[in-house]
Amino acid sequence: CHHRICHCSNRVFLCQESKVTEIPSDLPRNAIELRFVLTKLRVIQKGAFSGFGDLEKIEISQNDVLEVIEADVFSNLPKLHEIRIEKANNLLYINPEAFQNLPNLQYLLISNTGIKHLPDVHKIHSLQKVLLDIQDNINIHTIERNSFVGLSFESVILWLNKNGIQEIHNCAFNGTQLDELNLSDNNNLEELPNDVFHGASGPVILDISRTRIHSLPSYGLENLKKLRARSTYNLKKLPTLEKLVALMEASLTYPSHCCAFANWRRQISELHPICNKSILRQEVDYMTQARGQRSSLAEDNESSYSRGFDMTYTEFDYDLCNEVVDVTCSPKPDAFNPCEDIMGYNILR
């Protein structure tokens, strides 16, 4: 572990500061981590990391002159599970062929860059659950259809918050098993079109806080368990509750919206077919009793990723066999915002 210009320890290489003007061609191919921090790299050239068969992590951070990432930079790296590209405000272009064949990828971060389009992830083909973390890229305005096809054969978490997203096309999430979608803090985002989740499974968690979204799509929310819409002042109405059959937790803007969940009963037709099997009824009742108050989904500040992808909700949820739905909703109605004002006693009864 020795290099003329990069620091290293135990096969981790740190290429740091202004003396680093290009990716050194003589970095040992058995490196397990590469970090490029505060450098003067302008271009990351095609094939810069080819042959790094043991490479697990790449970090490219605080590189203020970086402009371009060429094709085949992150390609054919069998052990690579983490890529971080952050604080590169002059990074305007990532070649569509930059990310290819990364079977172990679990985390891809692109934040605080100048890119205008989402990176092309169609050829990543990860065999792992992937967290795609694309934040603080104020020049990304659109999410095109099929934007995440080919990212992973497993489920994905998409953190797309704090970008400049203004428009999301129908079928944007086609082909994904969407565990979590975070669109918060895209202040100019006004619409989630009706078919935005067409071809997708999920989302299970959806965060649209601090956007201008005025309505949720009519389709694709069947698996939604947790909805966050804090400070989403344009969201004046929710879909009919029949569209939110799995919802268990809602964190909303207006207390009045929580009134909708008071004494909500699922129609028998909405229950999962397994619930009708009489052999299972006793077991289901016992299990739901024993579990009592279910463990809450990921805390607001804790991602499913940080808990090691402990996605318990992918198993069958016997609570869905309860007719009475206990949705945890906030902000709760109170003396100043009583449900009676908007719903009336008759409906509540």
């Epitope: 020795h2 290099h3 003329r4 210009i5 620091h7 290293c8 740190l14």
Partner: antibody, heavy 120, light 111 residues
């Protein structure tokens, strides 16, 4: 085979200027990643880093002595120079020239040192 | 400045036994996952010689009985098994930030 050799006056009077020369072989200060520095050690005491210079002429000084230090190089003749102005008795020490690798800032090879005595 | 404090100041170890020297930094010497902490050996009348760099990486040609460990602010140098030739002064040194500084040294002798 890397070799470094220090040369200096041996004895100086207080307030005089110390001029040290490091002559080296086995590497070039024109090669990226290479640096040469100076470290001193008073007899029977610890080590003090003074200054170093990189291949690209980037220089770093110990802030406690910066106002008195000047480091320079002549890459073509494989030499590095250190000037210490206004010496005092506390500058009495063995002065080592060191080859530094930018990777890990490693003090890879040391000269045998030259002794300076400051006495009136 | 980052102050490095070595302990003990001196140490007597039997041949074949383990010598452990500690080096504590006044603040972390880690940067982006790498510890900028080196260990040197100095014998009387000779310049120091690099043994360990980046806390735990052995310089080529250094015997395997020398090993380093630690991160952040706490580091140690181990010599095992102790040999006659290992009688010397040992210094830790940080190069995380200028001014690069050295510990006060530990004198290791044979008991």
């Amino acid at each position: 085979q890397v070799n470094l050799k220090e040369s200096g006056p041996g004895i100086l009077q207080p307030s005089q200027t110390l001029n040290l020369t490091c002559s080296f072989s086995g590497f070039s200060l024109s090669t990226s990643g290479m640096g040469v520095g100076w470290i001193r050690q008073p007899s029977g005491k610890g080590l003090d880093w003074l200054a170093h210079i990189w291949w690209d002429d980037d220089k770093r000084y110990n802030p406690a002595l910066k106002s008195r230090l000047t480091i320079s190089k002549d890459a073509s003749s494989n030499q590095v120079f250190l000037k210490i102005a206004s010496v005092v008795t506390a500058d009495t020490a063995t002065y080592y020239c060191v080859q530094i690798n930018y990777g890990n800032y490693r003090f890879d090879n040391w000269g045998h040192g030259t002794t300076l005595t400051v006495s009136s | 400045d980052i102050v490095l404090t070595q302990s003990p100041a001196s140490l007597a170890v039997s041949l074949g036994q383990r010598a452990t020297i500690s080096c504590r930094a006044s603040e972390s010497v880690d940067n982006y996952g790498i510890s900028f902490l080196n260990w040197f050996q100095q014998k009387p009348g000779q310049p120091p010689k690099l043994l360990i760099y980046a806390a735990s990486n052995q310089r080529s040609g250094v015997p395997a009985r020398f090993s380093g460990s630690g991160s952040g602010t706490d580091f140690s140098l181990n010599i095992h098994p102790m040999e006659e030739d290992d009688t010397a002064m040992y210094f830790c040194q940080q190069s995380k930030e200028v001014p690069w500084t050295f510990g006060g040294g530990t004198k290791v002798e044979i008991k």
